[in-house]
């Protein structure tokens, strides 16, 4: 019989404790949020907030720019200075709650912890490939906010998602807040609303649309807004919230929230509960029926998926797919399975799943005993009846009022458990060439880039490295720019090429051969690298 | 200071295309919104539709299968095509730019005239 | 589509105070239609004076404002001056995505 070379196990043909340096910035304070823009000139930015502070990169993260968002009633505070000469508000420092683009503009809108989460526009101006902040503008007019009703009043000290969706020639910011008794009786940001800027950016316009959490309710019933998108003709936010009103607050679930991006309003809200699983191939005994549930959301990204694992989801190509990275409990702490799992929800099911919900509260015959639900947000009703009515009004209509769906949307782990221990804090999702790549970070400041493929048992690696060598956690806000994708860590923005950060980590030819063509990987006498890295022979053929 | 500035034929033939140029200066079109907007002789203005800091367009539906709205972002102008023009057509063409919901800037206006 | 219908032709003295009205056929104007007036000169020269209701535009003098009144868009001049003799436009914005102009006002500062 021939002999043949023994072969290599998979897992010895990788080192992933092989070290890669990418670009970084070290921002002098935690990161507390991050955009970036890219223009149609070449010209591009990047922005992140820190206490106090908001800095103004170009895309090779060098700086470009500083400027002082606080503390407030600080006279060297220079976005607190265009609001005029204060006090505005008690003293405090700035913690950057919302930094979002207005591309129409375009401009960057940031918005803080301090002055009643108010908000301030900064104009870009290019200059050559690079791009600087215009003076602020407070968009905050005294005169036309109070406690109660304050359509200056966005951000929210507890957190606040916003998404800016162009309607016609309109920009709408769709808003999400959590809150508590004190954020709601101090110039209240109300949990979910739709505002418009004004056109002398003076502020946002009055009489905007909102919903917001019962007074009654605000002390049991509190909601994290984790993540916020717009594809198609909806706006989408994440939640992670206590199960039932009346119910033990700790027992948390994640619930997804629809809104209308074609018209600015609220009565086609509408909710539904995510449910995420991991449903081991062999059950243990004693484990529960459908998998052990992961009901608290951790992270999210929305984007179109590669070939294949469109046809494992029995979607098209290219259709927009939410993923999030789901734990057992707030802490994340450890369980009978993997720390983290994610978990797939194409859109398009989630919005047929919706409608199919909105059908069965609203068309004859109703099921009777099916409740509205959101009571959080509305007085209990049963279906069709709007909230708190025993009846529908002869001009009224179902369908124009809020509505949580009876059912919940399941999925399983797409990785089959085999994230193990990782606790992810950071995802982003690719598609390239026909592969969709998981970029996730991690609670121990690493990067790993993963093919996201349900039907294997082992993980396939773009690359899993370390960003750096304080151990941060990675934060959950990941930015694109270009082929880069920017991860925070502690006080520090890296930016990591979504093609991976190159291919010294595969040990083997063979292995090396075999990645990925977007990887750009080939055999280099003794190592595994890109042209770039090869003075000499590169071969991407065949191995030696 | 934005300045607008509209070129073309003062004389189109029925039946054939009507084209415009406006020329933008001190503000780059991949701001904001563009618009194109008619006076008839007897008073009456049209809007025509738009095209977006983005590219994306929007046309009045009496117009929407006859007109053309294109840009060139290099050049900083942006162009109008209407088919198919009849006499109708004859008026006074103006580009205007809106800035947060306000058509603040205008261009001079140029007048088409549509006759054999 | 809707129609937006002004007065005609109204005449006013200077220093006095006039108000140009706009209706719309599709009920009333509410802030969502953006209102803007627009003004026409002699010379057919265009200017942007007031958007999105109440807003002047740049450059635009304080005696020149905008509001609701009642179910239509309103232009108050106050204070006219023999300047402002001109064509006033109203626009409102519809939810499909575009402007409608109103017929026009010619105003006469005698």
């Known amino acids: 019989e021939d002999w043949q070379c023994p072969r290599t196990p998979y897992a010895a043909s990788r080192d992933f404790d092989v070290k890669y340096v990418v670009p970084s910035f070290s921002a002098g304070g935690l990161v507390q949020a991050m955009v970036t823009y890219e223009g149609d000139r070449n010209e591009s930015a990047v922005f992140v907030a820190i206490r106090n502070r908001l800095h103004v990169l170009g895309p090779d993260l060098k700086s470009v720019q500083s400027l002082a968002t606080g503390p407030a009633g600080d006279p060297g505070c220079q976005t607190c200075a265009a609001c005029g000469p204060g006090p505005h508000g008690p003293p405090g420092d700035t913690d950057t709650k919302v930094l979002v683009l207005d591309p129409a503009l375009p401009a960057l809108v940031s918005c803080g912890s301090s002055l009643q989460g108010r908000c301030f526009l900064h104009d870009l101006e290019p200059q050559g490939t690079a791009v600087h902040l215009a003076a602020p503008a407070c968009l905050f007019s005294a005169h036309h906010n109070r406690p109660d009703d304050c359509p200056d009043c966005v951000a929210s000290p507890l957190g606040t998602r916003v998404t800016v969706v162009e309607q016609g020639q309109a920009s709408y910011f769709y808003v999400a807040s959590s809150l508590d008794a004190a954020v709601a009786a101090s110039f209240s940001p109300r949990s979910v609303s739709i505002r418009r800027l004004k056109a002398d950016a003076s502020g946002f316009a009055p009489g905007f649309v909102a919903l917001s959490v019962l007074p009654k309710h605000l002390v049991s019933y509190s909601i994290e807004y984790v993540h916020s998108f717009h594809t198609g003709a909806f706006v989408y936010f994440l939640t992670v919230q206590p199960a039932s009103v009346t119910d033990d607050p700790s027992a948390l679930h994640t619930r997804l929230a629809r809104l209308s991006a074609t018209e600015p309003e609220l009565g086609d809200y509408r909710e539904l509960v995510l449910d995420c699983r991991f449903a081991p191939k062999r059950r243990r005994r004693g484990a529960p029926e459908g998998g052990q549930p992961y009901p608290v959301l951790r992270v999210a990204h929305s984007a179109p998926v590669g070939a294949q694992l469109a046809t494992e989801l029995s979607i098209a190509e290219g259709q927009e797919v939410l993923f999030g990275v789901f734990v057992t409990g707030k802490d994340g702490g450890p369980g009978v399975g993997p720390n983290s799992v994610v978990c797939a929800f194409p859109i398009d099911l989630l919005d047929t799943l919706i409608d199919e919900g909105v059908e069965r509260c609203c068309e004859s015959p109703v099921h009777p005993g099916l409740r509205r639900g959101l009571d959080f947000f509305q007085s209990p009703s049963f279906c069709p009846n709007p909230p708190g009515l025993e009846a529908l009004s002869p001009n009224t209509s179902c369908r124009h009022f809020p509505l949580l769906v009876s059912s919940s949307f399941s999925r399983v782990d797409l990785f089959n458990g085999l994230l193990g221990p990782v606790q992810v804090t950071a995802l982003y999702v690719t598609r390239l060439d026909n592969v969709t790549v998981a970029h996730m970070g991690t609670m121990d400041g690493r990067i790993l880039q993963v093919e996201l493929v349900r039907s294997l048992n082992y993980l396939l690696y773009v690359s899993n490295f370390s960003l750096g060598d304080s151990g941060q956690p990675v934060q959950r806000d990941v930015s694109r720019l270009g082929d880069h994708l920017l991860f925070a860590s502690g006080d520090q923005v890296f930016q990591v090429p979504i093609q991976g950060p190159g291919c010294r980590h595969f040990l083997t030819c063979g292995r090396c051969l075999r990645a990925w063509h977007f990887m750009g990987c080939g055999w280099c006498g003794n190592m595994c690298g890109q042209q770039k890295e090869c003075p000499g022979s590169w071969q991407q053929d065949h191995c030696p | 200071e934005v300045q607008l500035q509209e070129s073309g034929p003062s004389l189109v033939k029925p039946s054939q295309t009507l084209s415009l140029t406006c020329y933008v200066t001190g503000d780059s079109i991949t701001s904001d919104y563009w618009n194109w907007i008619r006076k008839f002789p007897g008073n009456k203005l049209e809007y025509m539709g738009y095209?977006?800091?983005?590219?994306?367009?929007y046309y009045n539906p009496s117009l929407k299968s006859r007109i053309s709205i294109t840009r060139d972002t290099s050049k900083n102008q942006f162009y109008l095509r209407l088919n198919s023009v009849t006499t109708e057509d004859t008026a006074t063409y103006y580009c205007?730019?809106?800035?947060?919901?306000?058509?603040?800037?205008w261009g001079q206006g140029t007048l088409v005239t549509v006759s054999a | 589509q809707a129609v937006v219908t002004q007065e005609s032709a109204l005449t006013t003295s200077p220093g006095e105070t006039v108000t140009l009205t706009c209706r719309s056929s599709a009920g009333a104007v509410t802030t969502s239609n953006f209102a803007n007036w627009v003004q026409e000169k002699p010379d057919h020269l265009f200017t942007g004076l007031i958007g999105?209701?109440?807003i002047r535009a740049p450059g635009v003098p304080a005696r020149f404002s905008g509001s609701l009144i009642g179910d239509k868009a309103a232009l108050t001049i106050t204070g006219a001056q023999t300047e402002d003799e001109a064509i006033y436009f109203c626009a409102l914005w519809y939810s499909n995505h575009y402007w409608v102009f109103g017929g026009g006002t010619k105003l006469t500062v005698l």
């Open positions: 999105d209701t109440n």
């Open positions: 095209i977006s800091y983005s590219g994306s367009t």
């Open positions: 205007a730019r809106t800035h947060i919901l306000t058509i603040a800037y």
